[in-house]
Interface confidence: medium
Amino acid sequence: SCNTATCVTHRLAGLLSRSGGVVKDNFVPTNVGSEAF
């Protein structure tokens, strides 16, 4: 599984579904971030 900073950031922000790669229409972001490219 992906554990780079971007992956963690996108999971925290709710951008990707558990199946991966699917952008949600609505998501609840967090303020606990991370960093990458």
Partner: antibody, heavy 122, light 107 residues
């Protein structure tokens, strides 16, 4: 306003050392993972190293090209990121940027510093 | 290491035209691809993250698509300020890698 300001670049001889700094402001520095990315003159972008947040024990990752020579570190009390560069080579000549990418509020945020130039030459 | 190959290396177009830039990954990276724009003497600027999400303040003429190994950045109608170098990057695996860049120049 988020700001990242790099410093410490300059001219150094092959085999020499240099320490770069990145002063951060405008966000809770200790919470976020942060990276160094470099760009040789006229060339493309190359990721150098990453350090995780305080809560992630400040774990680090490095590009193969710099592993064993460069050390990334942070001082959360000073909101500062560092890159200690040893055994420098001509191919390390580049503009070095620090960059942060994180989720904040309603969107992803991405910030880069203006860069600091490192020249390795005799 | 995941290699990103961008094409074409140089793209010569006129303002108002449509630009299509390609980025191919040597291994599957799901949607962990970003696109950056860079102008001479400036730091890179994030345009697209997560393959298709436009970054804050980026005009709607910029769009990204793709998943797996093939990704595309499209600029629907070029403005004079769009002529620059564009990089794709992947953050699915360490080390993070960038493509070699596509230079978008005025025809």
């Amino acid at each position: 306003e988020v700001q990242l300001v790099e410093s410490g670049g300059g001219l150094v001889q092959p085999g020499g050392s240099l320490r770069l700094s990145c002063a951060a402001s405008g966000f809770t520095f200790s919470n976020y993972w942060i990276s160094w990315v470099r760009q040789a003159p006229g060339k493309g972008l190359e990721w150098v190293a990453e350090i995780r947040s305080e809560s992630d024990a400040s774990a680090t990752h490095y590009a193969e090209a710099v592993k064993g020579r460069f050390t990334i570190s942070r001082d959360n009390a000073k909101n500062s990121l560092y890159l200690q560069m040893n055994s420098l080579r001509a191919e390390d000549t580049a503009v070095y940027y620090c960059a942060v990418y994180f989720d904040y509020g309603l969107a992803i945020q991405n910030y880069w510093g203006q860069g600091t130039l490192v020249t390795v030459s005799s | 290491e995941i290699v990103l190959t961008q094409s074409p290396a140089t793209l010569s177009l006129s303002p108002g035209e449509r630009a299509t830039l390609s980025c191919k990954a040597s291994k599957r990276v799901t949607t962990y691809v970003s696109w950056y724009q860079q102008k001479p003497g400036q730091a890179p600027r994030l345009l697209i993250y997560g393959a298709s999400n436009r970054y804050l303040g980026i005009p709607a003429r910029f769009s990204g698509s793709g998943s797996g190994t093939d990704f595309t950045l499209t600029i629907s109608s070029l403005e004079p300020e769009d002529f620059a170098v564009y990089y794709c990057s992947q953050s699915y695996n360490y080390p993070y890698t960038f493509g070699q860049g596509t230079k978008l120049e005025i025809k």
